[in-house]
Each structure stands twice: as structure tokens, then as C-alpha cells.
């Protein structure tokens, strides 16, 4: 059974992940970002189901493509280089989902834009945080 300290740690990690994803979304949606139109042409893949921490496997598998698309945006839109930003997210995701069980992600048939993709994972974080608090 999860202890209060482990629940608190999970909550803090999710909040950190949430902030990172929101920061990316804000950088992309920045009205000064001339790249938004181009960035929206790139396709992302969404999980069929995302209700548990193990489903973060689906986010982890799309982090490389996310970094590629962020590389298109002017670096001044973000506080960190895309590589560092994605590396930070990757570390949190690995800790949150755990490495004990190997979960095979199932993806939805429809693709998503980068904005839809980020919003989906932001909602996921918010949803899990609300169950922990």
C-alpha cells in the first residue's frame, strides 16, 4: 500500500510534469510563435486509455517526436533547450510509471496535433493529482 510520503512524492512529481507540459504548451501557443502552423502539421499518437500511472509509457514513447517538433520552434519560446526539457520530462515519467512492470501501450487510431497531445497529458496529470489530494 502506498504510504503518505510516497503519495506526496508522486503528487510532487506529477505537479512538476504538469508544469513542464504547460510550459511547452504556453511556448507553442505564444502569439509570437510563427511556427504554430507548421508545428500543427506534425502528427502525434494518443493512448486509447490513460487513467493510471503505467499509461505514462504512452507519453514516454512520444517524447522523441515531441523533441523533434520542439526543435522547430524558436528557442526563446522556452526557458530550456528542447533536449533538456524532454530529458527532464523523461526522468519524471520513468520515476512515475516505474520500471517493474512492462506495459505495452495501446494507441488510438486517430492522430493528434501537438496542442491536442499536450492538452491530453495535461488533463491526465490533473486527473491523477486530483485523486491523490
Amino acid at each position: 500500500a502506498p504510504t503518505s510520503s510516497s503519495t506526496k512524492k508522486t503528487q510532487l512529481q506529477l505537479e512538476h510534469l504538469l508544469l513542464d507540459l504547460q510550459m511547452i504548451l504556453n511556448g507553442i501557443n505564444n502569439y509570437k510563435n510563427p511556427k504554430l502552423t507548421r508545428m500543427l502539421t506534425f502528427k502525434f499518437y494518443m493512448p486509447k486509455k490513460a487513467t493510471e500511472l503505467k499509461h505514462l509509457q504512452c507519453l514516454e514513447e512520444e517524447l522523441k517526436p515531441l523533441e523533434e517538433v520542439l526543435n522547430l520552434a524558436q528557442s526563446k519560446n522556452f526557458h530550456l533547450r528542447p533536449r533538456d526539457l524532454i530529458s527532464n520530462i523523461n526522468v519524471i515519467v520513468l520515476e512515475l510509471k516505474g520500471s517493474e512492470t512492462t506495459f505495452m501501450c495501446e494507441y488510438a487510431d486517430e492522430t493528434a496535433t501537438i496542442v491536442e497531445f499536450l492538452n491530453r497529458w495535461i488533463t491526465f496529470c490533473q486527473s491523477i493529482i486530483s485523486t491523490l489530494t
Epitope: 502539421t41 506534425f42 514513447e61 512520444e62 517526436p65 523533434e68 522547430l72 520552434a73
Partner: antibody
Framework: EIQLQQSGPELRRPGSSVKLSCKAS????????IHWVRHRPEHGLEWIGW????????RYAQKFQSKATLTADTSSNAAYMQLSSLTPEDTATYFC??????????????WGQGTLVTVSS | DIVMTQSPFSLAVSEGEMVTINCKSS????????????LAWYQQKPGQSPKLLIY???TGQSGVPDRFIGSGSGTDFTLTISDVQAEDLADYYC?????????FGAGTKLELK
Amino acid sequence: EIQLQQSGPELRRPGSSVKLSCKASGYNITDYLIHWVRHRPEHGLEWIGWIDPEDGETRYAQKFQSKATLTADTSSNAAYMQLSSLTPEDTATYFCARSLDSTWIYPFAYWGQGTLVTVSS
Amino acid sequence: DIVMTQSPFSLAVSEGEMVTINCKSSQSLLRSGNQKNYLAWYQQKPGQSPKLLIYYASTGQSGVPDRFIGSGSGTDFTLTISDVQAEDLADYYCLQHYITPPTFGAGTKLELK
């Protein structure tokens, strides 16, 4: 028909610089990234970098960071690459290329005919 | 950077033979979301620009003869040319087109016996 037309061969002295051009036709240059690739027979193909002609944003392979400068001119639908501080090792054919479609950055599907740059004293 | 290890360096063949060229990447090129491998094959003849033959490891580019077949997944890929023709004599390169910087294999020279 999509075409990339590159400038003619160049002969340069070591230490000098050269500017190559790549004129696109059959599509609007601002719709896709333009990539540059170097070919040396003994070293094969090497990606130099890309430019987004829409806003001039660039990305370079680390080894070409201080060697190549990519620019674009949307009014003439053309991209350019300047190579500086030339050495005999820069002797190569340089290609510009465009991606297959707009759903990913790569692979390169449309290529210019190449520009041979010879660096010799 | 992802390292692409291509083999063999050169290959001497007779017309009508079948040849295989291998390419190994230092990281997986499989994107789970679409089950596509971001690996392309190019043909380059002397004095010409490279020509895209195969992308996503096995999708033939429009207009490319179907004797060029790409296969493989993850880190191991193969280009097979069945019934080699004289016009196929060229250099062949693999390219990973997943992560910047895109990286090419060292190339394979296909020569006539």
C-alpha cells in the same frame, strides 16, 4: 513539378568563403524546411543542417556549426549556404534537399543537382 | 547522435542476382505510436544526386521498381535488390530520419563482377 536548382561549380583558395544557392520551383519555399547535405566520395553523405525559410530559423549538425551559415530569401524562392574558412577538406559536392511531405521533417525526397566546391591553392 | 553501421562496404554482383545490404542503428528507430521505423534507403550514381528508394523502412517511393525491397525493424534493417540490373550499379546509403541530426550509413558500393 518540384525542382531544386543549384548554382554552378566553385573553385576557392584555402581560407576564403563561398556562397551556394538553391532555387526552388513547383512549390512555395516557405512551406517546407530546406536541408543541406555534403557528399565526399571517401566519407559518404553528411547532413549539414536545415533552415526554415518562413522565419530563417536554423539547425546545424555540430561539426558544421562554425563552418556553414544557412539563409533564405522568400521573394526569390531560394535558399543559400555560405561556407567559411575553407580548407581542402571542404572539397565536396553540396546538395540542397526538401522533405517528402509536411508530416515529418525527414526524409529528403527532392534534391538539387549538387554544387561541386573545390578548395585548392 | 545515432550511429548507422552499414555493411558490406562493397559488393560485386552479376546481372540477375539478388543482393542484400544491411544497416544497423545504435538506437531503435521504431515509433510505437504508428509502428513505423524511421529508416530510409538512397541510391546514388556517380555525378548524380541521391535518389530516395525506400522510407519508413519498407515503403517504396513512387516510381521505384519493386525489385527494391526494404525490411527490418527496431535497429536492424535490410535493403534487398532482387534481379539486379546494370542500371542498379551505384552507391547505396541508409539514413535514420527519426532524430536530429539525421545520420547516414557509410554506404555500400554495388559493382559488376
